[in-house]
């Protein structure tokens, strides 16, 4: 018995070959002897039942001259899994068709961190093995259900599942979209008084995007977090619902989600968490955003440089006179120089030599007041 594997919804070709390699009379039947189709000597395809009943069944007329009389079954259904009989030249050939189906649990659009379950449906009597490969090349294998917990952004794309049965294989491709922000976390470094822009690009595109979101902010100087803004998203249009009066935030109405602060101030330095709840999805998307603010000041004989906000302990804060070696350099959030000499001083926040933030302050001779450019 010949075995043919098929995929639900697609087409399968069941072979039937003549030894004489020329056109001959043939009939395809179900195992219960009901006729499907055939050719009775006039080169015309005759169907066995009503057109509606047999419209999915066909043959390749072009192959008949070569002695090939395949049965083509279109739009395969799971119930097409059975034995088909080809009668020709006083012999019967049995062809077994097994139709398989691989589906993703409930939805192919899943939130980052959620689980993906791939389920194989197979005909009774079959014992296939299945292996799926993620877009980032990770292989998972198992029985009729395969699960991946904690989906990551890199899991977005085409998953390829190979079903193996009796050394024959059939391949399924399933497009999975992991709903997430492009970055889990971002950090913005600003001098005091500068404008601040926060961007929250999504890592996916869908035709219609609807949901609601909120930005909670934990200022370093504050004892508790505060909701800065709430908004709705309807068909990719952002509409602000409620916004705090301090700071005076503005939010763009188009994607990607984008917020602006008129100026960076020490009291705003801290961490925010933007959450986005999408319509018909359980759970929320999250992106963390951090704001570090620098201020350089001179009070009487003391030149001070301070940073506020979430800085890593390995960051270095330095004060140096332009074109000279750093006068002071510490892994701390404030540095100062007593009785600084006149000139342009630079306050630098750096990470392994890379400058993240810089603020200049001009120190005038002792009889005058400092100027901040």
């Amino acid at each position: 018995k010949t075995l043919v594997l098929g995929k639900e919804g697609e087409s399968a070709e069941l072979p039937c070959e003549s030894s004489q390699k020329k056109i001959t009379v043939f009939t395809w039947k179900f195992s219960d002897q009901r006729k499907i189709l055939g050719q009775h000597g006039k080169g015309v395809l005759i169907r066995g039942g009503s057109p509606s009943q047999f419209d999915r069944f066909d043959s390749k007329k072009g192959a008949w001259e070569k002695g090939s009389f395949p049965l083509i079954i279109n739009k395969l259904k799971m119930e097409d899994s059975q034995t088909y009989i080809c009668e020709l030249e006083n012999r019967k050939e049995e062809v077994e068709l097994w139709v398989f189906k691989v589906t993703a649990n409930s939805d192919t659009h899943l939130l980052q961190g959620q689980s993906l379950t791939l389920t194989l449906e197979s005909p009774p009597g079959s014992s296939p093995s299945v292996q799926c490969r993620s877009p980032r090349g990770k292989n998972i294998q198992g029985g009729k259900t395969l699960s991946v917990s904690q989906l990551e952004l890199q899991d977005s794309g085409t998953w390829t599942c190979t079903v193996l049965q009796n050394q024959k294989k059939v391949e399924f491709k399933i497009d999975i979209v992991v709903l997430a922000f492009q970055k889990a976390s971002s950090i913005v470094y600003k001098k005091e008084g500068e404008q601040v822009e926060f961007s929250f690009p999504l890592a996916f595109t869908v035709e219609k995007l609807t949901g609601s979101g909120e930005l909670w902010w934990q200022a370093e100087r504050a004892s508790s977090s505060k909701s800065w803004i709430t908004f709705d998203l309807k068909n990719k249009e952002v509409s602000v619902k409620r916004v705090t009066q301090d700071p005076k935030l503005q939010m763009g109405k188009k994607l990607p989600l984008h917020l602006t602060l008129p100026q960076a101030l020490p009291q705003y330095a801290g961490s925010g968490n933007l959450t986005l709840a999408l319509e018909a999805k359980t759970g929320k998307l999250h992106q963390e955003v951090n704001l570090v603010v620098m201020r350089a000041t001179q009070l009487q004989k003391n030149l001070t440089c301070e940073v506020w906000g979430p800085t890593s302990p390995k960051l270095m804060l330095s004060l140096k006179l332009e074109n000279k070696e750093a006068k002071v350099s510490k892994r701390e959030k404030a540095v100062w120089v007593l009785n600084p000499e006149a000139g342009m001083w630079q306050c630098l926040l750096s990470d392994s030599g890379q400058v993240l933030l810089e603020s200049n302050i001009k120190v005038l001779p002792t009889w005058s007041t400092p100027v901040q450019p």
């Epitope: 309807k234 249009e237 939010m251 763009g252 188009k254």
Partner: antibody, heavy 119, light 107 residues
Amino acid sequence: EVELLESGGGLVQPGGSLRLSCAASGLTFSTFAMSWVRQAPGKGLEWVSGISGSGENTYYADSVKGRFTITSDNSKNTLYLQMNSLRAEDTAVYYCAKEGYNWNYMDVWGKGTTVTVSS
Amino acid sequence: AIQMTQSPSSLSASVGDRVTITCRASHGIRNDLGWYQQKPGKAPKVLISETSSLQSGVPSRFSGSRSGTDFTLTISSLQPEDFATYYCLQDYTYPYTFGQGTKLEIK
């Protein structure tokens, strides 16, 4: 070709009301955001009000908030601006404008209709 | 609301001159700014969208750029038909706001 035609302008006394209409042809109305923009005699352009394609979200300039109402009727492909408690400073040419598919810009404008508020 | 400060308010120039008009936004507005041309008695016409995207049918002598919250419209070589009033418009967020306008006149 997309065309916008405003109507409903005229002379009205302070405190009175007027409803402007903007009939659109050559487009699927519900797809695009729309706006009303005005220009007082000898002055610059002032954005007045906007509405999302779905009609669910409406927006207003502070100068007209609480007095003007923007609506749309997708079945009639028409945008409206209901103006109540009119003031002398509302005297202007009122233009309706269609926004691009992704709200990129106002790509189609009507010729405008004149509103005069005077006693 | 976001304020748009446009300068200069008027400008005299000659055919062939290079002209720049600037708009400053009171907040960061990404690239969500357009430039519009208006001639007396006519409706405005969009020249540039999203800071630098030239609209179809608009001559290439018009260009737009951005530096932070400063936006610039440049006309590389003025033509007689360019004498008009120019407006910037921020469409970053509602309420939208126009600049005060720049009237470009023949010197």
